[in-house]
C-alpha cells in the first residue's frame, strides 16, 4: 500500500508535470506566437483511456513529436529549450509510471491538435492530484 510519503512524492511530481505542461500550453497560446496556426496542423495521438499513472506511457510515446513541434516556436516563448523541457518531462513521466511496467498504450482513433493534446494531459494531472489530496 502506498505510504503517505510516497503519495506526497507522487503528488509533487504530478504538480511539477502539470506546471511544465501548462507552461508549454501558455507558450503556444501566447498572442505573440505567430506559429500557432501552423502548429495546429500537426497531429497528436490521445489515449483511449487515461485514469491511472500507467497511462502516462501514452504521453511518453508522444514526447518526441511534441519536441519537434516546439522546435518550430520562437524559443523566447519558453523558459527552457524544447529539448531540456521535454527531457525534464520525460524524467518525471518515467518516475511516475514506473520503468518496470510494460503497459501497451491504446490510442483513440481521432487525432488531436497540440492544444487539445496538452489540455488532455493537464486534465489528467489535475484529476490524479485531486484523488491524492
Amino acid at each position: 500500500a502506498p505510504t503517505s510519503s510516497s503519495t506526497k512524492k507522487t503528488q509533487l511530481q504530478l504538480e511539477h508535470l502539470l506546471l511544465d505542461l501548462q507552461m508549454i500550453l501558455n507558450g503556444i497560446n501566447n498572442y505573440k506566437n505567430p506559429k500557432l496556426t501552423r502548429m495546429l496542423t500537426f497531429k497528436f495521438y490521445m489515449p483511449k483511456k487515461a485514469t491511472e499513472l500507467k497511462h502516462l506511457q501514452c504521453l511518453e510515446e508522444e514526447l518526441k513529436p511534441l519536441e519537434e513541434v516546439l522546435n518550430l516556436a520562437q524559443s523566447k516563448n519558453f523558459h527552457l529549450r524544447p529539448r531540456d523541457l521535454i527531457s525534464n518531462i520525460n524524467v518525471i513521466v518515467l518516475e511516475l509510471k514506473g520503468s518496470e511496467t510494460t503497459f501497451m498504450c491504446e490510442y483513440a482513433d481521432e487525432t488531436a491538435t497540440i492544444v487539445e493534446f496538452l489540455n488532455r494531459w493537464i486534465t489528467f494531472c489535475q484529476s490524479i492530484i485531486s484523488t491524492l489530496t
Partner: antibody, heavy 121, light 113 residues
Framework: QVQLVQSGAEVKKPGSSVKVSCKAS????????IHWVRQAPGQGLEWMGW????????AYAQKFQGRVTLTADTSTSTAYMELSSLRSEDTAVYYC??????????????WGQGTLVTVSS | DIVMTQSPDSLAVSLGERATINCKSS????????????LAWYQQKPGQPPKLLIY???TGQSGVPDRFSGSGSGTDFTLTISSLQAEDVAVYYC?????????FGAGTKVEIK
Amino acid sequence: QVQLVQSGAEVKKPGSSVKVSCKASGYSITDYLIHWVRQAPGQGLEWMGWIDPEDGVTAYAQKFQGRVTLTADTSTSTAYMELSSLRSEDTAVYYCARSLDYDPIYPFAYWGQGTLVTVSS
Amino acid sequence: DIVMTQSPDSLAVSLGERATINCKSSQSLLRNGNQKNYLAWYQQKPGQPPKLLIYYASTGQSGVPDRFSGSGSGTDFTLTISSLQAEDVAVYYCQQHYVTPPTFGAGTKVEIK
C-alpha cells in the same frame, strides 16, 4: 516546379568563413523549412540544421552549433548557410534541401545541385 | 542521436535480379499512435544530389518506379529493387525522420555483376 539553385564552388583558407546561397523557386520560400546537409568526398550524408524562412527560427546539429549560421532573405527567396572557422575536414559538397511538408523531420524531397567547398592552405 | 547501420557496404547484382539492402536503427522508429515507421530511402548517383525513393518505410515517392519497395518495422528495415536495371547503379542511403537530428546510414553501393 520546385527548384533550389545553389551558388558556385568555393576555395577557402583554414580559419576563414564561407557563405553558400540557395535560391528557391516554384513555391513560396516561407511555406517550408530549408535544411542543409553536407557530404565529404566519398562519404555519407550529414545533416547540419534547418531554418524556417518565415521567421528565422533555426535548429542546428550539436556538432555545428556555434560554427554555422543559417539565414534567409524572403524578398529574394534565398537561404544562406555560413560556416566559420573552416578546417580541412569541412571540405565537402553542401546541399540545401526542402521537405515534402512543413515538418522539421519530414524527408527531403527537393535538393539543390550542391556546392563544393574546398578548404586548403 | 539515432545511429543508422546499413548492410552490406556494397552489392553486385545481375541485371533483372533482386537487390536487397538492410538498415538497422539504434532505437525504434515506430510511432505507436499512427503505427508509422519514420524511415526514408534515398538513391544517389555520382555528381548528383540524393533522390527520395521511399518514406514512412514503405510509401513510394511520386514518380519512383514500383520496382523499388520498402519494408520493415521498429528497428529493422529493407529496401528491395525487384529487378535491377542499369540505371539503378548508385549509392543507397537510409535515413530516420523520427527525431532531430535526422541521421543517415553510411550507404550501400549497388553495382552490376
